[in-house]
């Protein structure tokens, strides 16, 4: 294959890979027809004038996970056909201006994952050509006015996890063809009133995990094609009335981990095209009407781990189209009748960890579509008659960690329970909690002859039987259709893997696995 | 259908106390709000408080904290609104009001007359 | 507390005549707006409910727009029954609270 080196492997693709930690140098001579070259977990640790020299044919460089700390300004000199060179992974402080001088055809360039401590106008000024340029984990405090005014065409822009503490307005001006731009895992505080007005395609937007405590009113309203919107794990406390006015089609909005209280008026909208809002882990103490109401097609709801109280009636307006509403961890003693009725797709709720003490006999009563209910950890004493009658898809009901009360008047809960008991999942099975006799028995199997009659026996005898259609499987516990294991945070649809992170913290909503990744 | 019908027309003495009833019937009463409203004699129509029969927890206007309590009888289908201490600007028709599909008040009671005067 | 301001207190109107009356609340109170018709000895009756809804049973002649702060009750075409009061109430935040109405009388 036209002369290849020893530590490295060459394909009939002209491709060239060179890994391990015996290499310390470029090695040599490297085939010349060369179009791919990848040098990996090596111990180089400088790159010297012109070690590509020969292989001017190259449209791929990848460099990584090296020791590399210095690079010669001509390194790359010769490389004229480069689409895609990646530095990332290595050891790099500085960069030499002139670095990139010469790569014309160059696409993408990924600096992601070194030491850098800043960036110049003067680094990428020839780089005309550039799409995608990853700057994240690196070390960068601020970033210069005209640090990317010569790259128009940039299309990706990742600044995560570096040491930003503010942003110029001016910064991104010239960037009209950006669409993704990441600037999570900073230090920013906030962000000044026109930092984004110039990216007009933009399509994602990433500022979670930052130290932002105020948006500016019209920070996205010139963001009309921003889809991915995310806000996480910062200080915002309240959200300016008309802050998410101008976002047609946005479909993902997370919010959640920061210190909202209330929720605005008319705060999400119009946005036609959100599918999911994540809210958990903020103090949100109460919900009023219409406060989701101009979005039409959302169908995952996060409001988990609040303070919320109390939902009025028609806090859910709207919401024809919602399939996941997960309420969980919050202060709730009461629901109205009325408060899930427009709900008629929901498939999964969660109620778990709250302080409910009884449900309305219709608080399900228009959404016959539910299949996973979760309403373990409250403080129901019992059920009403027939609350799960019309329910025919529920094949997932938790109950547990409730005080029942044992007496006849549990007879028709109790029978139902024993009919539809694969919906109980085979964990933890309800149990009495009083009489003080029958504590700590199950729910299912007691005899309530041996409890304390209640005062008022109810006529009918049991529950009509829910129909449990043998084509329903009774998930076991592991492949639960609503698990109570949940994620942290929504997968973040980002194609870095190095801003994926992983975690085993899924306590955050009740939701279907399919959901939860 | 939903009905809500309140006591009758109360004079009471200044400092004493009034309780009105409000009994429902045509729904579950421990399944939604129930609102107390009142209007004194040309006046706007003020919110006083709510109550969520099924647990008894009640929500006031700050303005009659203290002197307000709202209860209800699950048995009897009926709420109650007691103040207290009462003044001549009490003077009012005294509602319960049940919400609909919002925080809006659907269903009203007929009202009851609460006169103060010594 | 949120203030609810009525506007006119009163007017004086014909059979046939079209009639606005504004509600202008203190802060922003998104949709959470809801109109009343009180006539007198009797309870208030549920006409518009969030901003522009008509409750069941009334009369198309009723319209109701607005969001925010700005809210407008029209009677596009004025009936002998439509002699009454009329109050605006926003039901985003508690203490929930009402205009101090609009009486339309005969002229």
């Known amino acids: 294959y036209h002369g290849c080196p020893s530590e490295c492997t060459c394909s009939r693709a002209s491709q060239v890979e060179c890994t391990g930690a015996r290499i310390v140098a470029v090695p040599t001579p490297l085939p010349w027809n060369a179009m791919s070259l990848q040098i990996l977990n090596t111990h180089i640790t400088e790159l010297n004038e012109s070690p590509f020299l020969n292989i001017s044919a190259l449209i791929a460089l990848r460099i990584e996970k090296n020791e590399l700390s210095r690079i010669t300004p001509g390194a790359f000199r010769n490389l004229g056909s480069l689409r895609y060179l990646s530095l990332a992974n290595n050891k790099l402080q500085v960069l030499p201006i002139g670095l990139f001088q010469g790569l014309d055809s160059l696409e993408s360039l990924l600096l992601s994952s070194n030491q850098l401590l800043q960036i110049q106008p003067a680094h990428f000024s020839q780089c005309s050509n550039l799409k995608e340029l990853q700057l994240h984990g690196n070390h960068l405090e601020y970033i210069p006015d005209g640090a990317f005014d010569h790259l128009v065409g940039l299309t990706k822009l990742n600044l995560g996890k570096n040491s930003l503490t503010h942003i110029s307005p001016r910064v991104f001006q010239h960037l009209g063809n950006l669409q993704v731009l990441r600037l999570y895992e900073n230090r920013l505080t906030d962000i000044p009133m026109g930092t984004f007005d110039g990216l007009v395609n933009l399509q994602e937007l990433a500022l979670q995990q930052n130290q932002i405590g105020l948006l500016s009113p019209g920070l996205f309203h010139n963001n009309h094609n921003l889809q991915r919107l995310y806000l996480s794990n910062n200080h915002i406390s309240q959200l300016p009335p008309s802050v998410f006015m101008q976002l047609p089609q946005l479909n993902r909005l997370t919010l959640f981990g920061n210190s909202l209280k209330e929720l605005s008026p008319g705060i999400f909208g119009p946005m036609p095209n959100l599918r999911e809002l994540w809210l958990y882990d903020n103090h949100i103490s109460s919900l009023p009407d219409n406060v989701f109401s101009n979005l039409r097609q959302l169908q995952v709801l996060i409001l988990s781990r609040n303070q919320i109280s109390f939902i009025s009636p028609g806090a859910f307006n709207g919401l024809t189209e919602l399939r996941e509403l997960s309420l969980h961890t919050n202060a709730l003693q009461d629901l109205d009748g009325n408060v899930f009725r427009m709900l008629a797709n929901l498939q999964n709720i969660s109620l778990q960890n709250n302080r409910l003490r009884q449900l309305p006999g219709n608080i399900f009563a228009n959404v016959n579509g539910l299949m996973a209910i979760q309403l373990q950890n409250n403080q129901l004493e019992n059920l009403p008659l027939g609350i799960f009658d019309h329910l025919g898809k529920l094949c997932e009901l938790r109950l547990y960690d409730n005080p029942w009360r044992c007496d006849s008047d549990i007879l028709p809960l109790r029978n139902w329970l024993l009919l539809n008991q694969p919906r109980l999942g085979t964990d933890t099975v309800p149990v009495c909690f009083s009489p003080a006799n029958v504590r700590g028995q199950s729910l299912i199997i007691i005899n309530v002859n041996v409890a304390v009659p209640s005062v008022h026996v109810p006529e009918v005898p049991s529950y009509p039987e829910t129909p449990w259609y043998p084509d329903t499987p009774s998930y076991p516990d592991t492949t639960s259709v609503s698990s109570t294991t949940e994620l942290t945070s929504p997968v973040e649809d980002y194609t870095d893997l190095t801003t994926i992170q992983v975690t085993d913290d899924r306590s955050v909503w009740g939701m279907t696995q399919a959901q939860s990744g | 259908q939903v009905q809500l019908v309140q006591s009758g027309a109360e004079v009471k003495k200044p400092g004493a106390s009034v309780k009105v009833s409000c009994k429902a019937s045509?729904?579950?009463?421990?399944?939604?709000?129930i609102n107390w409203v009142r209007q004194a004699p040309g006046q706007r129509l003020e919110w006083m408080g709510w109550?969520?029969?099924?647990?008894?927890?009640?929500k006031y206007n700050e303005k009659f904290k203290g002197r307000v309590t709202i209860t209800r009888d699950t048995s009897a289908s009926t709420a109650y609104m007691e103040l207290s201490s009462l003044r001549s600007e009490d003077t009012a028709v005294y509602y319960c009001?049940?919400?609909?599909?919002?925080?809006?008040?659907?269903?009203w009671g007929q009202g009851t007359l609460v006169t103060v005067s010594s | 507390d949120i203030q609810m301001t009525q506007s006119p207190s009163s007017l004086s109107a014909s059979v046939g005549d079209r009639v606005t009356i504004t509600c202008k609340a203190s802060?922003?109170?998104?949709?959470?707006v809801a109109w009343y018709q009180q006539k007198p000895g009797k309870a208030p009756k549920l006409l518009i409910y969030s901003a522009s809804y008509r409750s069941s049973g009334v009369p198309s002649r009723f319209s109701g727009s607005g969001s925010g702060t700005d809210f407008t009750l029209t009677i596009s075409s004025l009936q002998p029954e439509d002699f009454a009061t009329y109050y605006c109430?926003?039901?985003?935040?508690?203490?929930?609270?009402f205009g101090g109405g609009t009486k339309v009388e005969i002229k």
């Open positions: 109430q926003q039901y985003n935040s508690f203490p929930y609270t």
């Open positions: 009001a049940r919400w609909g599909y919002g925080a809006y008040f659907t269903y």
């Open positions: 045509g729904y579950t009463f421990t399944d939604y709000y």
């Open positions: 109550i969520y029969p099924g647990s008894g927890n009640t």
């Open positions: 802060q922003n109170v998104g949709i959470n």
